[in-house]
């Protein structure tokens, strides 16, 4: 058993049929010595008396809010949550496996630049009695500070018969060094509590590996005289790290016809303009990627040829 | 050329070669899915690699103030990785394919380190990998880790030379 926060405790249980469970001793936080009784949740049934209560925790019915009283007055509470371990593996019932970029990916994170700011998100089908708490650091043995906000519900989607809820959190490294080569990964830890079930999820990454620039901005076409060619120009996204002579991007320019089956013409360039042939009903799209490190491409910025 | 005395390197040549290094480092080991092997026991070989750290002066301001600190750090890293790529981790079994980009990568590391420090000039401290023979069964994982680490190192080096070529070239 360990303390998650004040008066909230997590009991770690090996979860299998007829498991013996864990013996837990609760102590009433009071100077009083006698006349103390214990109850669980809203029940008025007295579970025991005395300053301590010993219970055998085997299942969710044994978890919940234990309260000690004296003469009708509440002295203190202890909330017991269960953390299940099945076949040596901690349960992951609360969050959905996003399966990208690999199986058992519950947390996904992205950064728009090298400032040390990043966003993580996760999915669940649970809509009520759900709380999340997020902690983060750079490195684990001698951790350096990363400050995370509160997790918020950021999107709701309907997937077949189910509703899916997306939660996200923003974090910022306290002393970020954008130009340095990271040697210790960022660690993100999410505590998830659904009713009386506790689970924790972790992710470990370098900022450089989760970089995904915003799409290029101000995408414009300039027809060239007496030609089917156009000059496409764009700018670095505002959110990208500066100076651009140091934090450089590379770009992919694509000409795509109306039909998905039509052949796509692609040009790669380090410049912020390119000359392409604009076909009728086609559109021109540009996306960006870090020039020197192959992290994710941005989403496309597009304009119609006409 | 970054002679230890303090003259400027051939920024544009260094920029071109460092960008080629980035391309080679990724073609030598493309990011397969997101094959995250950081958990797989940190061997000394990959722990000891020199990193370009915050105080090394490789940020735009530091380069403006005095690029020598940063260039020395980059040189140190290039020599270190060049030695790693010549070690039995890469020359031993399982053999690299004859057309593997590792050979070109190796030559380019040497080329850039020589651009930074021509024959006959020496920066004092050198960090050299202390390499005990690697067991064949460890080598694929070690190669993966070294190349991932090299990708990060050459990305910073390429930024330094791109910025230098754009803003510090005579």
């Amino acid at each position: 058993i360990w303390e998650l926060k004040k008066d909230v405790y997590v009991v770690e249980l090996d979860w299998y049929p007829d498991a013996p469970g864990e013996m837990v001793v609760l102590t009433c936080d009071t100077p009083e010595e006698d006349g103390i009784t214990w109850t669980l949740d809203q029940s008025s049934e007295v579970l025991g008396s005395g300053k301590t209560l010993t219970i055998q925790v085997k299942e969710f019915g044994d978890a919940g809010q234990y309260t000690c009283h004296k003469g009708g007055e509440v002295l203190s509470h202890s909330l017991l949550l269960l953390h299940k371990k099945e076949d040596g593996i901690w349960s992951t019932d609360i969050l959905k496996d996003q399966k990208e970029p690999k199986n058992k990916t519950f947390l996904r994170c992205e950064a728009k630049n090298y400032s040390g700011r990043f966003t993580c998100w996760w999915l669940t089908t649970i809509s009520t009695d759900l709380t999340f708490s997020v902690k983060s650091s750079r490195g684990s043995s001698d951790p350096q500070g990363v400050t995370c906000g509160a997790a918020t519900l950021s999107a709701e989607r309907v997937r077949g018969d189910n509703k899916e809820y997306e939660y996200s959190v923003e974090c910022q490294e306290d002393s970020a060094c954008p130009a340095a080569e990271e040697s210790l990964p960022i660690e993100v830890m999410v505590d998830a509590v659904h009713k009386l079930k506790y689970e924790n999820y972790t992710s470990s990454f370098f900022i450089r590996d989760i970089i995904k620039p915003d799409p290029p901005k101000n995408l414009q076409l300039k027809p060239l005289k007496n030609s089917r060619q156009v000059e496409v120009s764009w700018e670095y996204p505002d959110t990208w790290s500066t100076p651009h002579s140091y934090f450089s991007l590379t770009f992919c320019v694509q000409v795509q016809g109306k039909s998905k089956r039509e052949k796509k013409d692609r040009v790669f360039t380090d410049k912020t303009s390119a000359t392409v042939i604009c076909r009728k009903n086609a559109s021109i799209s540009v996306r960006a990627q870090d020039r020197y490190y192959s992290s994710s491409w941005s989403e496309w910025a597009s304009v119609p040829c006409s | 050329r970054a002679v230890p005395g303090g003259s400027s390197p051939a920024w544009t040549q260094c920029q071109q070669l460092s960008q080629k290094l980035c391309t080679l480092a990724w073609s030598a080991h493309p990011l397969v899915g997101h094959m995250d092997l950081r958990e797989e026991g940190d061997e000394e070989t990959t722990n000891d690699v020199p990193h370009i750290q915050c105080g090394d002066g490789c940020d735009p301001q530091g380069l403006r103030d005095n690029s020598q600190f940063c260039l020395q750090r980059i040189h140190q890293g290039l020599i270190f990785y060049e030695k790693l790529l010549g070690s039995d981790i890469f020359t031993g079994e399982p053999s690299l394919l004859p057309d593997s980009p590792v050979g070109q990568l190796h030559a380019s590391l040497l080329g850039l380190s020589q651009l930074l420090q021509p024959e006959g000039h020496h920066w004092e401290t050198q960090q050299i990998p202390s390499l005990s023979p690697s067991q064949p069964w460890q080598r694929l994982l070690l190669r993966f880790k070294i190349l991932r680490s090299l990708q990060a190192f050459v990305a910073v080096a390429a930024r330094v030379f791109a910025h230098g070529a754009a803003t510090l070239s005579p």
């Epitope: - | 010549g86 070690s87 039995d88 020359t91 031993g92 053999s95 023979p133 067991q135 069964w137």
Partner: antibody, heavy 115, light 107 residues
């Protein structure tokens, strides 16, 4: 075409030393390790050690430490093995071979130690 | 050291027979196992690398299988020129060790 050409047979007296060579051609000498293997008459194969011609790093079978010394010369793409304090137990055919999985072996050097 | 045990020591076969040569490692060597053929007064010749990978120029009748500590070299239709001694080799860890060999004879 990859070839490993080994030096000719040696007849030496007990207590003496011998240095045999293995000249590589048809590939970049510094790209692969060079292993040395011993085979006594009518017996099996025994690994002696390897040299990395790129950096002259060596790795020996504990059994041959102090007996065999591996060196190489990049300029002539040649690997060498010196055997010291020879006894009749050292009489054998000695092979050089680049990385096991490349499948190229020298033709062998026959060493006879006899007074 | 990893001990490589080959069986049988000698195998007498008729041309056209399918034969299996066994090799056992004293501990797991994953698939880091190579097979060699050595004919009288010749250098060893690599037949199979990494337990099952074929080698260019080696007839397709030779194949390898196994992983961990149990390995097999199969010759699916023995030819008279296949006579010789077959060795398996631990390519997993130092010191590299060879089996004592299986001698293949033609009846």
């Amino acid at each position: 075409e990859v070839q490993l050409q080994q030096s000719g047979p040696e007849l030496v007296k007990p207590g003496a030393s011998v240095k045999m060579s293995c000249k590589a051609s048809g590939y970049t000498f510094t790209t692969y390790l060079m292993h040395w293997v011993k085979q006594k008459p009518g017996q099996g194969l025994e690994w002696i050690g390897y040299i990395n011609p790129y950096n002259d790093g060596t790795n020996y079978n504990e059994k041959f430490k102090g007996k065999a010394t591996l060196t190489s010369d990049k300029s002539s793409s040649t690997a060498y093995m010196e055997l010291s304090s020879l006894t009749s137990e050292d009489s054998a055919v000695y092979y050089c071979t680049k990385n096991w999985d490349k499948g190229y072996w020298g033709q062998g050097t026959t060493l006879t130690v006899s007074s | 050291d990893i001990v490589m045990t080959q069986s049988p020591a000698t195998l007498s076969v008729t041309p056209g027979d399918r034969v299996s040569l066994s090799c056992r490692a004293s501990q797991s060597i994953s698939d880091y196992l190579h097979w060699y053929q050595q004919k009288s007064h010749e250098s060893p010749r690599l037949l199979i690398k990494y337990a099952s990978q074929s080698i260019s120029g080696i007839p397709s009748r030779f194949s390898g299988s196994g992983s961990g500590s149990e390995f097999t070299l199969s010759i699916n239709s023995v030819e008279p020129e296949d006579v010789g001694v077959y060795y398996c080799q631990n390519g997993h860890s130092f010191p590299f060790t060879f089996g004592s060999g299986t001698k293949l004879e033609i009846k």
